[in-house]
């Protein structure tokens, strides 16, 4: 069985839908990004206990590694987080979803290392240019997601202090050659391009020279286009709620989507005494969906007024776009009014929350 080879580039804090079982989803993140992997239950049925595994070893939750039954979040990703991730059923170890994650060096903002490699008097009487930090110039190919900032650096020295100029694909490169311009930081021997786009792909050459000689280094930039993805829902929303009979309740859902999302609020219901259809998928009714005059902001909140015991149950925020769907659910527990609780306590009854 061949593995899927689609290269999916995911922007910051992007939740990645789980691939079909048997397919390996190949994902690229920038360092510092939040890696979010999502593995919905196959067939929509109950998932059972799951474990997340990286390179064959079970992942241990921490402040940076957040593990849930259907989702894994790795905050502030670094190169060490690259590897093969899978979500498995705990008992059978059956692989439900499989991801290949690569964390690329996120280019710096262009400002965070200012002053590090400024031209210095090396004490050499005279001499041709040379690289002062060649170990920092090893990475000749840079692949970054679109909209990131790229910084190429060629720290050098010589006497007299050499000049630096830049070429793109062998031709002189100036700010007017790209939308958004460029920043040339001669003191830091750097070229900075903000918010890169696919047309920025190419070979970038720094030329460092003085009257005694010339050296050059070429970097290749590949700009990875963000592939469209299904909507992303903010973790933890909607949140479970407990309310007293007759009170008002609000569920919140925060949706991020490149393509225009279609948001719905669903209530899980019973039909003929069953919570699921013949095929095991939960019965739902649509409580709220987009209207001609409804804003996305309004749709991100479900308000329930004067709640009754019938309002208790499971609610789902469902967001869909042309690519697919994402959903998060929460429970509403409705408690009797306080005076009823008091009466019940006096009668010796016990309520389990």
């Amino acid at each position: 069985e061949s593995l899927g080879t689609e290269q999916r580039v995911v922007g910051r804090a992007a939740e990645v839908p789980g691939p079909e079982p048997g397919q390996q989803e190949q994902l690229v993140f920038g360092s510092g990004d939040a890696v979010e992997l999502s593995c919905p239950p196959p067939g929509g049925g109950p998932m059972g206990p799951t474990v997340w595994v990286k390179d064959g070893t079970g992942l241990v939750p921490s402040e940076r590694v957040l593990v849930g039954p259907q989702r894994l979040q790795v905050l502030n990703a670094s190169h060490e987080d690259s590897g093969a991730y899978s979500c498995r059923q705990r008992l059978t170890q059956r692989v439900l979803c499989h991801f290949s994650v690569r964390v690329t060096d996120a280019p710096s903002s262009g400002d965070d290392e200012d002053g590090e490699d400024e031209a210095e008097d090396t004490g050499v009487d005279t001499g041709a240019p040379y690289w002062t930090r060649p170990e920092r110039m090893d990475k000749k190919l840079l692949a970054v997601p679109a909209a990131n900032t790229v910084r190429f650096r060629c720290p050098a020295a010589g006497n007299p202090t050499p000049s630096i100029s830049w070429l793109k694909n062998g031709r002189e490169f100036r700010g007017e050659h790209r939308i958004g311009g460029i920043k040339l930081r001669h003191q830091q021997w750097s070229l900075v391009m903000e918010s890169v786009v696919p047309s920025d792909r190419g070979n970038y050459t720094c030329v460092v020279e003085n009257k005694f000689g010339s050296i050059r280094q070429t970097y290749t930039l590949d700009v990875l286009e963000r592939s469209p993805h299904r909507p992303i829902l903010q973790a933890g929303l909607p949140a479970n709620q407990t309310a007293v009979l007759g009170s008002d309740v609000e569920f919140h859902c925060k949706v991020y989507s490149d393509a225009q999302p279609h948001i719905q609020w669903l209530k899980h219901v019973e039909v003929n005494g069953s919570k699921v259809g013949p095929d095991g998928t939960p019965y739902v009714t649509v409580l709220k969906t987009a209207g001609a005059n409804t804003t996305d902001k309004e749709l991100e909140v479900l308000s329930l007024h004067n709640v009754t015991f019938e309002d208790a149950g499971e609610y789902t925020c469902l967001a869909g776009n042309s690519i697919g769907f994402s959903h998060h659910s929460a429970w509403l527990v409705v408690l009797p009014a306080e005076e009823e609780l008091v009466e019940a306590d006096e009668a010796g009854s016990v309520y389990a929350g």
């Epitope: 739902v284 969906t289 209207g291 697919g324």
Partner: antibody, heavy 126, light 110 residues
Framework: QVQLVQSGAEVKKPGASVKVSCKAS????????MHWVRQAPGQGLEWMGW????????NYAQKFQGRVTMTRDTSISTAYMELSSLRSEDTAVYYC???????????????????WGQGTLVTVSS | DIALTQPASVSGSPGQSITISCTGT?????????VSWYQQHPGKAPKLMIY???NRPSGVSNRFSGSKSGNTASLTISGLQAEDEADYYC??????????FGGGTKLTVL
Amino acid sequence: QVQLVQSGAEVKKPGASVKVSCKASGYTFTSYYMHWVRQAPGQGLEWMGWINPNSGGTNYAQKFQGRVTMTRDTSISTAYMELSSLRSEDTAVYYCARGYWYAYFTYINYGYFDNWGQGTLVTVSS
Amino acid sequence: DIALTQPASVSGSPGQSITISCTGTSSDVGGYNYVSWYQQHPGKAPKLMIYDVSNRPSGVSNRFSGSKSGNTASLTISGLQAEDEADYYCQSYDNNSDVVFGGGTKLTVL
């Protein structure tokens, strides 16, 4: 973009069966319900039923119960509709239509058809 | 067995506005805000024009609008154009969660 491509026209004899295919592309096949709707010559649209490509679950209109079978092959993103015991009044254009129903749920009274196949003409004639 | 009632035909001149009605019961149109409308040109597949009573999919002209009052949904086309000439169908649900269509309305642009 989303595309539903149906199989070609069929001519069948009364009593025979016909199987129409609908190949989906441009979206995640298992995320949306697939419906079948038919239209007899000069008549209106008639809903036949749906299949949930994710679970394989089906729901058929009362009129077609016992005669229609909807199946899918997720490996090739294709849905199928088979109608048996054909009679002349089954002569119609048969459409597959993607329903805006998320396939992880069974909806009560909700959804619409946001993409349609080009239609397959099935002629039943002796 | 058509569950929703539409006029068999309506007509209008270019630039005019026309309205097509779709009448059901409290078990279908009246019970849910989930009526949709489809346009069908001769020999072509239907095309979604309005969903959830009044929403337009992207790519559909804002000359098309939908509304609902009680058990009757309506499709209004303003600034009528020759290419609007087609059949129009409404769609909703019945209490068995079955999809129901209207009988269709033939729109003629004079």
